[in-house]
């Protein structure tokens, strides 16, 4: 029961985690910037992995997608790759874990097969969660190291003067969603791996052994069947024959003075 609960909970936690990773990957708020309060209106910028957006206090919002692949920063490409790998692994893990669930019966699937599938999905969830956490952390590190506070280093460009806009780059909501989702997927994966141990069948087979006392405990019943004492039922290897004949499992019982007809 505990194994089923652990497996089921691991599945649900991973499902929520992967949904979160997908949500974080699609979100636009990975990086948010408060672009100075200019004389017109408060301009708020935010960027995601796929597009950049501008929002103004007037209510105007516009987003533009990154239509080029080659020109984008390598870090952004790396984060995209990590998030996509996380989603793909997580999705495959979910698919595998559905069939591995103890509460779902598929044909004559053995417990050992379910245990292996549970372990496989658990490992996939762990890797998926790590990918998401790594992706979000790489992006966060990129913000911290490069953009935390842009300094107004002015230099001359071809068309005149160029300066970096005084902007404070902060962590967007997507980063927190990604961290939490990655963590949940990781926890779910660990739970699946723990459940796998409980699902694995024990390999110890105990042979039914019948113990008989010598002589005095063996009686011939009127019906001609020998009554056997001891532990275990006479269903596996033992047949009781008329006249008290022994089977291959039995030890010969010799008549004694206590025997009676």
């Amino acid at each position: 029961m505990a194994v089923t609960a652990c497996q089921g909970l691991g599945f649900v936690v991973s499902l929520i985690g992967i949904a979160g990773i997908i949500a974080a990957t699609c979100m636009d708020q990975w990086s948010t910037q408060d672009l100075y309060n200019n004389p017109v209106t408060a301009v708020f910028n935010y960027q995601g992995l796929w597009r950049s957006c501008v929002r103004e206090s007037s209510g105007f919002t516009e987003c533009r997608g990154y239509f080029t692949l080659l020109g984008l920063p390598a870090m952004l490409q790396a984060v995209r790759a990590l998030m996509i790998v996380g989603i793909v692994l997580g999705a495959i893990g979910l698919l595998v874990s559905i069939f591995a669930l103890k509460c779902i019966r598929i044909g004559s699937m053995e417990d050992s097969a379910k245990a292996n599938m549970t372990l496989t999905s658990g490992i996939m969830f762990i890797v998926s969660g790590l990918c998401a956490i790594a992706g979000v952390s790489v992006f966060a590190n990129m913000l911290v190291t490069n953009f935390w506070m842009s300094t107004a280093n002015m230099y001359t460009g071809m068309g005149g003067m160029v300066q970096t806009v005084q902007t404070r780059y902060t962590f967007g909501a997507a980063l927190f969603v990604g961290w939490v989702a990655g963590g949940l997927t990781l926890i779910g994966g660990v739970m699946m791996c723990i459940a796998c141990r409980g699902l694995a069948p024990e390999e110890t087979n105990y042979k039914a052994v019948s113990y008989h006392a010598s002589g005095h405990s063996v009686a011939y019943k009127p019906g001609g069947f020998k009554a056997s004492t001891g532990f275990g039922s006479n269903t596996k290897n033992k047949k009781i024959y008329d006249g008290g004949a022994r089977t291959e499992d039995e030890v010969q019982s010799y008549p004694s003075k206590h025997d009676y007809v």
């Epitope: 960027q47 501008v54 105007f60 020109g71 842009s150």
Partner: nanobody
Framework: QVQLVESGGGLVQPGGSLRLSCAAS????????MGWVRQAPGKGLEWVAV???????NYADSVKGRFTISRDNSKNTLYLQMNSLRAEDTAVYYC????????????????WGQGTLVTVSS
């Protein structure tokens, strides 16, 4: 490389009109706020007008009601329609634009043009 090129300046009589243009070119991803700043002879920089991507505008008190700022987002072009010009409007007019580049959409820069001279004299 990004360039901001102003045009339309020249000599005009008081009460006359001029239309300045500023064209931004290069590997621009998105232009945010654009504006006009002027520098009269022997004086400091004075902001004239600004416009956001969503067309919210604001003007310096000295030009309110006389100047109109506008932009064409699709062409990355900024305009300044100057009417009822006065002698005190004589200055070099610079356009500036807050933009990010296609190669790094996560960092914003302010680019400035070389300026165009407007002379109001009779």
């Amino acid at each position: 490389q990004v360039q901001l090129v102003e045009s339309g300046g020249g000599l005009v009589q008081p009460g006359g009109s001029l239309r300045l243009s500023c064209a931004a070119s290069g590997s621009i991803f998105m232009i945010n706020v654009m504006g006009w700043v002027r520098q009269a002879p022997g004086k400091g920089l004075e902001w004239v007008a600004v416009i956001t991507r969503g067309a919210s505008t604001n003007y310096a008190d000295s030009v309110k009601g006389r100047f109109t700022i506008s932009r064409d987002n699709s062409k990355n072009t900024l305009y300044l329609q100057m009417n009822s010009l006065r002698a005190e409007d004589t200055a070099v007019y610079y356009c500036n634009a807050d933009l990010n580049l296609a190669s790094d959409p996560f960092k914003w820069y302010t680019y400035w043009g070389q300026g165009t001279l407007v002379t109001v004299s009779s």
